[in-house]
């Protein structure tokens, strides 16, 4: 996801098919305010960025609105009038879905079903991770819709759950970003808890002298 050109490192993120963020690390232009110019159609004139991201008082990125029919971003990063990086990219490659919204849980004996509102576009996986204090690693389950049932749970144990959305590789390629995790929610005996005990770490073997 990072492109390089003339000392410029570029990162593109396409948030939820709504907002494109292009950021740069301009090592060769330490005190310059680079400007960002873009268009979504080759035949249009370039627009200049109106929402810049600033770092230490200097431009380091741009946020721009996109629509779902906008596929290709043509952009130019300039130092004054001199273009220092110019590119055109399929922006779907850089998709980052939004975090699961309206997350709810329903318990039935030794299983829990997590549901949330499906996002409005296709090609997504909804992943739930869970663990008890006896697990050192998160366990994972994912489905094509936000209706994920985790089975074989012990109702007496406290479980922490979190969820996220991922773009399917066969729809968007392998270089997308998963959403941020939802807040961790803890459950025991079908009721919410503020927290679960921390996972136990196995004791380190004592080294004989």
């Amino acid at each position: 996801q990072v492109a390089t050109g003339e000392g410029l490192q570029i990162q593109i993120m396409y948030f939820n098919l709504e907002t494109v963020q292009v950021t740069w690390n301009a090592s060769h232009y330490p005190r310059s305010n680079l400007s960002f110019h873009y268009k979504f159609s080759r035949d249009e004139a370039y627009d200049q960025c109106t929402v810049y991201i600033l770092q230490e008082g200097h431009t380091s990125g741009c946020l721009l609105d996109a629509e779902q029919q906008d596929d290709i971003l043509y952009f130019s990063i300039r130092n004054g009038t001199h273009p220092v990086f110019t590119a055109s990219r399929w922006i779907f490659y850089y998709l980052k879905p939004s975090s699961p919204k309206q997350v709810s849980f329903s318990w039935h004996q030794d299983a829990v079903t997590l549901t949330c509102s499906d996002l409005s576009y296709r090609g997504l996986l909804y992943e739930v991770q869970y663990r008890s204090p006896f697990d050192t690693e998160w366990q994972s389950k994912q489905e094509n819709t936000c209706n994920v049932t985790v089975e074989d749970l012990d109702a007496e144990k406290c479980y922490a759950f979190r969820a996220r959305v991922k773009a399917m590789e066969d729809a968007y390629g392998p270089d997308t970003y998963p959403s941020d995790w939802s807040e961790v929610t803890c459950w025991q005996r079908g009721e919410t808890r503020d927290s679960c005990p921390e996972p136990r770490t196995p004791p380190k073997p004592k080294l004989s002298k």
Partner: antibody
Framework: QVQLVESGGGLVKPGGSLRLSCAAS??????????WTWIRQFPGKGLEWMGY???????YYNPALKSRITISRDNAKNSLYLQMNSLRAEDTAVYYC??????????????WGQGTLVTVSS | EIVLTQSPDFQSVTPKEKVTITCRAS??????LHWYQQKPDQSPKLLIK???RSISGVPSRFSGSGSGTDFTLTINSLEAEDAATYYC?????????FGQGTKLEIK
């Protein structure tokens, strides 16, 4: 198993036009998510992507060719077409149609036709 | 557009040898780099997708690696039928572009 067969190649005079066809079998060109493309290969063996048409009829063209080409399709015939105008000698090439690998227009091409040779010469 | 440069342009190799072909992109493309094989008088055939993902039906002696700007196609234990021209192709940049090709000759 998708099979693609191009036709319509041959000798064309400079300044003339061509219309190439690509008949698909074993797979519907309207299958959701799939895009179809034209790619040409010059006598020196270099490959150039020309453009896509999607299951939704949306088209994308190589900026170097955009003003001279049109890609279209006929769902009833399960075929796609390449119309190219103002031909010049440097358009001499083998023209291939191909299918995108994924349910998306932006990836590798997993099925290719056998190609049709277009020679532009007076 | 993103320029892909392959090396070498030509390689003459004996059967059972290991062959490495490289492809360098003028801008970073993540892992969205694909490899094709074209035998004489045939159309190109997809060998490797997304830098390293294998394609059903392609012999396991073909493998790929790399990300960012530098990619490699490796053929382990070359066979006579591998005589062909090999092309890389990038997909995130618009327009999609191909490398100039590497011709592999079997001695």
């Amino acid at each position: 198993q998708v099979q693609l067969v191009e036709s319509g190649g041959g000798l064309v005079k400079p300044g003339g036009s061509l219309r190439l066809s690509c008949a698909a079998s074993g797979f519907s060109i309207t299958t959701s998510g799939y895009y179809w493309t034209w790619i040409r290969q010059f006598p020196g063996k270099g490959l150039e992507w020309m453009g896509y048409i999607g299951y939704n009829s949306k088209t994308y063209y190589n900026p170097a060719l955009k003003s001279r080409i049109t890609i279209s399709r006929d769902n009833a015939k399960n075929s796609l077409y390449l119309q190219m105008n103002s031909l010049r000698a440097e358009d001499t090439a083998v023209y291939y149609c191909a299918r995108s690998l994924y349910g998306g227009y932006k990836d590798a091409f997993d099925s290719w036709g056998q190609g049709t040779l277009v020679t532009v010469s007076s | 557009e993103i320029v892909l440069t392959q090396s070498p342009d030509f390689q003459s190799v004996t059967p059972k040898e290991k062959v490495t072909i490289t492809c360098r992109a003028s801008q970073s493309i993540g892992t969205s780099l694909h490899w094709y094989q074209q035998k004489p008088d045939q159309s190109p055939k997809l060998l490797i997708k997304f830098a390293s993902r294998s394609i059903s039906g392609v012999p396991s002696r073909f493998s790929g690696s790399g990300s960012g700007t530098d990619f490699t196609l490796t053929i382990n234990s070359l066979e006579a039928e591998d005589a062909a021209t090999y092309y890389c192709q990038q997909s995130p940049g618009f327009p999609p572009t191909f490398g100039q090709g590497t011709k592999l000759e079997i001695k």
